[in-house]
Interface confidence: low
């Protein structure tokens, strides 16, 4: 049989941040290779990462076509001797289907993790500070342009700003569903800032990790009376 002595993949895991999406699995192959297939619920299966000895497959190009679709994926274990003929077929010498394992369904818009945000700049004018969060580019395209995180998520995405006086540890918070905050500060005081991306409507993967801390008096800031 063409499928003898193959081991089905296991521990299939989606790793996705800001829509960069990789499917990982185990085990490392011995006398076998893998091919991955992906489809939408209503679409045809498309093969990716043909006859690979890797235990991961980058599926970003497929899922960014429609991040609100639900995707199904499966990993086929193919005997080594049937993978050397250069034909992009998944079937063994007698035409039977090799063993495969299904990944859990993946909905990019719901499941991709939010990457660590970056504070782009902050500007103080008197007792107000405008803090701007970098609108990170994703790999999602529209009209040959890469969309930003805000373009994709719109108002579903908010940012939480944590800010505190450099001289104390008491943190205050503000929220925005644009990429800017306007906060009141005490004149003559230096403040530090950190932001976090949040999608409040989600039940899992709601929050990113905190951005690196930026403090007034550093080069990202600007001060005007």
């Amino acid at each position: 049989s063409g499928t003898t002595n193959t081991v089905a993949a296991y521990n299939l895991t989606w790793k996705s941040t800001n829509f960069k999406t990789i499917l990982e699995w185990e085990p490392k192959p011995v006398n076998q290779v893998y091919t991955v297939q992906i489809s939408t619920k209503s679409g045809d299966w498309k093969s990716k990462c043909f006859y690979t000895t890797d235990t991961e497959c980058d599926l970003t190009d497929e899922i960014v076509k429609d991040v609100k679709q639900t995707y199904l994926a499966r990993v086929f274990s193919v005997p080594w001797r049937n993978s050397t003929h250069g034909k992009e077929t998944l079937f063994g010498t007698h035409g039977e289907e090799p063993p495969f394992t299904n990944a859990r369904k993946f909905l990019p818009y719901r499941d991709t993790k939010l990457g660590q945000p970056t504070i782009q700049s902050f500007e103080q004018v008197g007792t107000k500070v405008n803090v701007t969060v970098e609108d990170e580019r994703t790999l999602v395209r529209r009209n040959n342009t890469f969309l930003s995180l805000r373009d994709v998520f719109g108002k579903d995405l908010i940012y939480t700003l944590y800010y505190w006086k450099s001289s104390s540890s008491g943190k205050k918070t503000a929220k925005t569903n644009t990429n800017e905050f306007l906060i009141d500060v005490d004149k003559g005081e230096n403040y530090c800032f950190s932001v976090q991306a949040v999608i409040p409507s989600r039940t899992v993967n709601r929050k990113s990790t905190d951005s690196p801390v930026e403090c007034m008096g550093q080069e990202k800031g600007e001060f005007r009376e």
């Epitope: 805000r150 373009d151 108002k155 925005t176 644009t178």
Partner: antibody, heavy 125, light 108 residues
């Protein structure tokens, strides 16, 4: 102070496409707000049509989604509504509005604080 | 979609009286997303209250909002002649954003 002004034909024939433009003055359309279209049928309540962010990201009312396109032209400080295959049921006053300001006192809020005066569109042959 | 039901449909009161307008949602609405608008004939709606209870800049303090979950209330403590109009509640948290059917406050 931001002001909005709707413009477009007041009479559209059935099956044609209704096209309206909202011009933003006194502020930049790219300042981080969302921009909405709302309509009001004669003697009736308000119906939200959809909204756009200056980057072009849109959300539509599912009941109209198949017929609606909202677009933005940041160079002209305008956003537009197109509603295809209109019928008499699309006769209404159409308003554009700003969704703002999104953050206040550590909370985030959604509401429409600036509205255009409205423009009446009649669908009739 | 979230359906907002306003009651009563019409409220007939005299100047100086208190008006209590109700807005009930078909499912829970985060109060951050609940707003009230006033509309007079031939005019666009005007924002009165956002976040269920925060008055918009320039709105007199006789207007107040309260409530959470599925039940929200707009109160006009003492009606002035210019307050006779139609009032709408709106939720802007879940697409499609929806408005209530309106309550008309008319002079008795």
């Amino acid at each position: 102070q931001v002001q909005l002004q709707e413009s477009g034909p007041g009479l559209v024939k059935p099956s044609q496409t209704l096209s309206l433009t909202c011009t933003v003055s006194g502020g930049s359309i790219s300042s981080g707000q969302y921009w909405s279209w709302i309509r009001q049928h004669p003697g009736k309540g308000l119906e939200w049509i959809g909204e756009i962010y200056y980057s072009g990201s849109t959300r539509y009312n599912p009941s109209l989604k198949s017929r609606v396109t909202i677009s933005v032209d940041t160079s002209k400080n305008q956003f537009s509504l197109k509603l295809s295959s209109v019928t008499a049921a699309d006769t209404a006053v159409y308003y554009c509005a700003r969704d703002a300001p999104y953050y206040y006192g550590g909370g985030y809020y959604y509401y429409m604080d600036v509205w255009g005066k409205g423009t009446t569109v009649t669908v009739s042959s | 979609e979230i359906v907002l039901t306003q009651s009563p449909g019409t409220l007939s009161l005299s100047p100086g009286e208190r008006a209590t307008l109700s807005c009930r949602a078909s499912e829970s609405v985060d109060s951050s997303y609940l707003a009230w608008y006033q509309q007079k004939p031939g005019q666009a709606p005007r924002l009165l209250i956002y976040g269920a209870s925060t008055r918009q800049t320039g709105i007199p303090d006789r207007f107040s909002g309260s409530g959470s979950g599925t039940d929200f209330t707009l109160t006009i403590s003492r009606l002035e002649p210019e307050d006779f109009a139609v009032y709408y509640c709106q939720q802007a948290g879940v697409v499609p954003y929806t408005f209530g059917g309106g309550t008309k406050v008319e002079i008795k």
